[in-house]
């Protein structure tokens, strides 16, 4: 049975250019996380192996820095980087688990960040 | 069973056209990124094409880019490379391949079809 | 583009002993690179990922080591089998690019 929870840095807005941390975090479970695969919509942008460090996606290899932690630097962005971004936990015995996270990148120079929320 | 098997490839003239197909089975074909790899006769690999799960992001390398489009069809479980413009040097052995899903990596690679650019 | 420069072009051993395989690659690729076998007739077969591990089913003989630039494929004790055409790989950036091989044949 999966109990664990993802908890999320949930909406969040950035400006152009700038950059921003996406976070997600397991709890409420003694599974042992084996990977983290960040992804964006469509695309992989990085995966961390609990065992052999992590690989950034070539796609996004200039714009896309690990950690920190198991989470995700994203940076020099634009417009286009707007949308869902996915964490997803690979863990044994429990098997995946999935968190979502809603970036919006302003052009302006207000951008507040969203509350905390939990995906079971 | 993982199974990747292409199909499409033939003899075609300098300029001319050719789609080829890969047909997909033994996996949830939607869950995986995918890519075409191409060998030259007697020569080493050379990679020719990079799809993502959706279909939404597409990456080439110089050598074909503007003239090859890969594709994919989630539906039919069917992976899909246009060749426009062909040239002698893009005569090879086309593979299709499956990124693992624990890197970037290929894990499982079809039996490939051999295209011939020729007059 | 990265250039994976593999050595030696062919390598001659005796079954039952040990080869090491080298690449290098013209820039640092950090630990993304990859090892592939490919027998004659046959597709490329996944071996090693992540410069060292071994990806599922590939027997323990086998073992990759390296990051940076310098990488080695070493098979401890040659089978019968293992006699092909040994690929590293680079997916550290675009475009992917592929050593150019390296033969082990039987001495």
């Known amino acids: 049975m999966m109990t664990g929870t993802i908890e999320t840095t949930g909406n969040i807005s950035a400006e152009k250019g700038g950059s921003i941390i996406l976070q997600c975090h397991l709890s409420s479970t003694t599974a042992q996380v084996t990977q983290v695969n960040w992804e964006q919509q469509d695309q992989l942008l990085a995966i961390c192996n609990a065992d052999l460090g992590w690989h950034i996606s070539p796609s996004f290899k200039d714009r896309v820095a690990p950690g920190p932690g198991l989470g995700l630097t994203l940076q020099s962005l634009t417009v286009n980087d707007t949308g869902e971004y996915f964490c997803i936990y690979h863990t044994y015995p429990d098997g995946t688990y999935t968190g979502r996270i809603f970036l919006e990148v302003l052009e302006s120079s207000v951008a507040e960040h969203g509350a905390r929320f939990q995906i079971p | 069973e993982v199974q990747l098997v292409e199909s499409g490839g033939g003899l075609v003239q300098p300029g001319g056209s050719l789609r080829l197909s890969c047909a997909a089975s033994?996996?949830?074909?939607?869950?995986?990124?995918m890519y075409w790899i191409r060998q030259a006769p007697g020569k080493g690999l050379e990679w020719v094409a990079y799809?993502?799960?959706?279909?939404?992001?597409?990456y080439y390398p110089d050598s074909v880019k503007g003239r090859f489009t890969i594709s994919r069809d989630n539906a039919k479980n069917t992976l899909y490379l246009q060749m426009n413009s062909l040239r002698a040097e893009d005569t090879a052995v086309y593979y299709c391949?499956?990124?693992?899903?624990?890197?970037?990596?290929?894990?499982?690679w079809g039996q490939g079809t051999l295209v011939t650019v020729s007059s | 583009e990265i250039v994976m420069t593999q050595s030696p072009a062919t390598l001659s051993v005796s079954p039952g002993e040990r080869a090491t395989l080298s690449c290098k690659a013209s820039?640092?690729?950090?630990?993304?690179v990859a090892w592939y076998q490919q027998k004659p007739g046959q597709a490329p077969r996944l071996l090693i990922y992540?410069?060292?591990a071994r990806h599922t089913g590939v027997p323990a003989r086998f073992s990759g080591s390296g990051s940076g630039t310098e990488f080695t494929l070493t098979i401890s004790s040659l089978q019968s089998e293992d006699f092909a055409v040994y690929y590293c790989?680079?997916?550290?950036?675009?475009?992917?690019?592929f050593g150019g091989g390296t033969k082990v044949e039987i001495k």
């Open positions: 033994g996996f949830t074909f939607s869950d995986y990124y």
């Open positions: 820039q640092d690729v950090g630990t993304s």
């Open positions: 799809i993502t799960k959706g279909g939404g992001s597409t």
């Open positions: 992540w410069a060292s």
């Open positions: 790989q680079q997916y550290s950036s675009y475009p992917l690019t």
């Open positions: 391949a499956r990124q693992t899903n624990y890197d970037f990596t290929m894990d499982y």
